[in-house]
């Protein structure tokens, strides 16, 4: 026997109470398949939420952050502070990289610079709490004899000492 | 028969987790919400959330989000409610219930009682 | 959140005579209101839903009537199965779905 719900369209109901007929969604509700006995509440955008895309009686609505803030979790389930670049977000907020670390990013974690010694490169660039280092020719690329290797410029001063 | 069969009570330690169960018998378990509602020893009842076993959608209480975990075992017919972080106020019957149309509750399990206690 | 209200917290009456049990919403619930009852040890049980649709195999002595904030479950001839706790719930537009604190109704 078939069920009758199964000709219910997304965008409504199958309500038991009216013998079986489709109703459409309530108001700030969706449906977005076939055959549902209730329809699923939409997504409100919130506070640092911002609609993206507002609520059918077909599809949820699709929330970003506002700015300052960015996206975290499947379809934006959080959002973050962010910080500036050179910062990384604790729990008592933004703070400075430590030195030997950068963040590139408004998001995210500041990370270590490259070793370049491990490939057995020299440092072309210093780093900086924004910026890597940039890695140069191994050092033995430089050595007489080698093909000639513009000198690199000063290493500017590091980034940022301890506090 | 249509009906939700819960889980056994639980005695739990403070800052413990626990996590209840809701199993579906008599209709078919991903055309209905399983909605999770709180009863305090002698006070009224406080809607938790609901997720739809259908897509595993959830919504929340607000005052609940960081508390409860909803989720479900569709080929068991089973939804269960992990609550985390207990403290004396979580302590209560937990009832878990059904929607169909609109959103009240024509079916109810029996409730677990969940006792927070050092 | 939308606040529930009933009204009186307790009910005593005689079997056989009427109750009438009132709940008010702090907005309008359009008819998006149910009633359950509850008795000691036992999950509540759906009475009436969109104010005042009896649930299926509810007797017809109960019966619910109202919209927008203000609303009424009557027994019309209190049996002694009758005697427990009665709750309002609106499920109007965006959750959470919020309970009134209930009536007892109480032999008298």
């Known amino acids: 026997l078939q069920d009758p719900c199964s000709n219910c369209p997304a965008g409504t109901f199958c309500d038991n109470n009216r013998n079986q007929i489709c109703s459409p969604c309530p108001p700030n509700s969706f449906s977005s398949a076939g055959g549902q006995r209730t329809c699923d509440i939409c997504r409100q955008c919130k506070g640092v939420f911002r609609t993206r895309k507002e609520c059918s009686s077909t599809s949820n609505a699709e929330c970003d952050c506002t700015p300052g803030f960015h996206c975290l979790g499947a379809g934006c389930s959080m959002c973050e502070q962010d910080c500036k670049q050179g910062q990384e977000l604790t729990k008592k907020g933004c703070k400075d990289c430590c030195f030997g670390t950068f963040n590139d990013q408004k998001r995210g974690i500041c990370r270590p610079w490259t070793n370049c010694s491990l490939d057995g490169k020299s440092v072309l660039v210093n780093g900086t709490k924004e910026r890597d280092v940039v890695c140069g020719p191994s050092p033995a690329d430089l050595s007489p004899g080698a093909s000639s290797v513009t000198p690199p410029a000063p290493a500017r001063e590091p980034g940022h000492s301890p506090q | 028969q249509v009906q939700l069969q819960q889980s056994e009570a639980e005695l739990v330690r403070p800052g413990a987790s626990v996590k209840i169960s809701c199993k579906a018998f008599?209709?078919?378990?991903?055309?209905?919400?399983i909605n999770w509602v709180k009863q305090r020893p002698g006070q009224g009842l406080d809607w938790i959330g609901y997720?739809?076993?259908?897509?595993?959608?959830?919504t929340f209480n607000r005052k609940f989000k960081d508390k409860a975990t909803l989720t479900v075992h569709k080929s068991s017919s089973t939804a269960y409610m992990e609550l985390s972080g207990l403290t004396s106020d979580d302590s209560a019957v937990y009832y878990c219930?059904?929607?169909?149309?609109?959103?009240?509750?024509?079916?109810w399990g029996r409730g677990t009682v969940v006792t927070v206690s050092s | 959140e939308i606040v529930m209200t009933q009204s009186p917290a307790t009910l005593s009456v005689s079997p056989g005579e009427r109750a009438t049990l009132s709940c008010r919403a702090s907005?309008?619930?359009?008819?998006?209101l149910a009633w359950y009852q509850q008795k000691p040890g036992q999950a509540p049980r759906l009475l009436i839903y969109?104010?005042?649709t009896r649930a299926t195999g509810i007797p017809a002595r109960f019966s619910g009537s109202g919209s927008g904030t203000d609303f009424t479950l009557t027994i019309s001839s209190l049996q002694s199965e009758d005697f427990a706790v009665y709750y309002c719930?609106?499920?109007?537009?965006?959750?959470?779905?919020?309970f009134g604190q209930g009536t007892k109704v109480e032999i008298k």
């Open positions: 219930a059904r929607t169909w149309g609109h959103w009240y509750f024509d079916l």
């Open positions: 008599g209709y078919t378990f991903t055309n209905h919400h």
């Open positions: 997720i739809n076993p259908y897509n595993d959608y959830t």
């Open positions: 907005q309008s619930v359009s008819s998006n």
């Open positions: 969109d104010s005042s």
């Open positions: 719930q609106q499920y109007n537009n965006w959750p959470p779905w919020t």
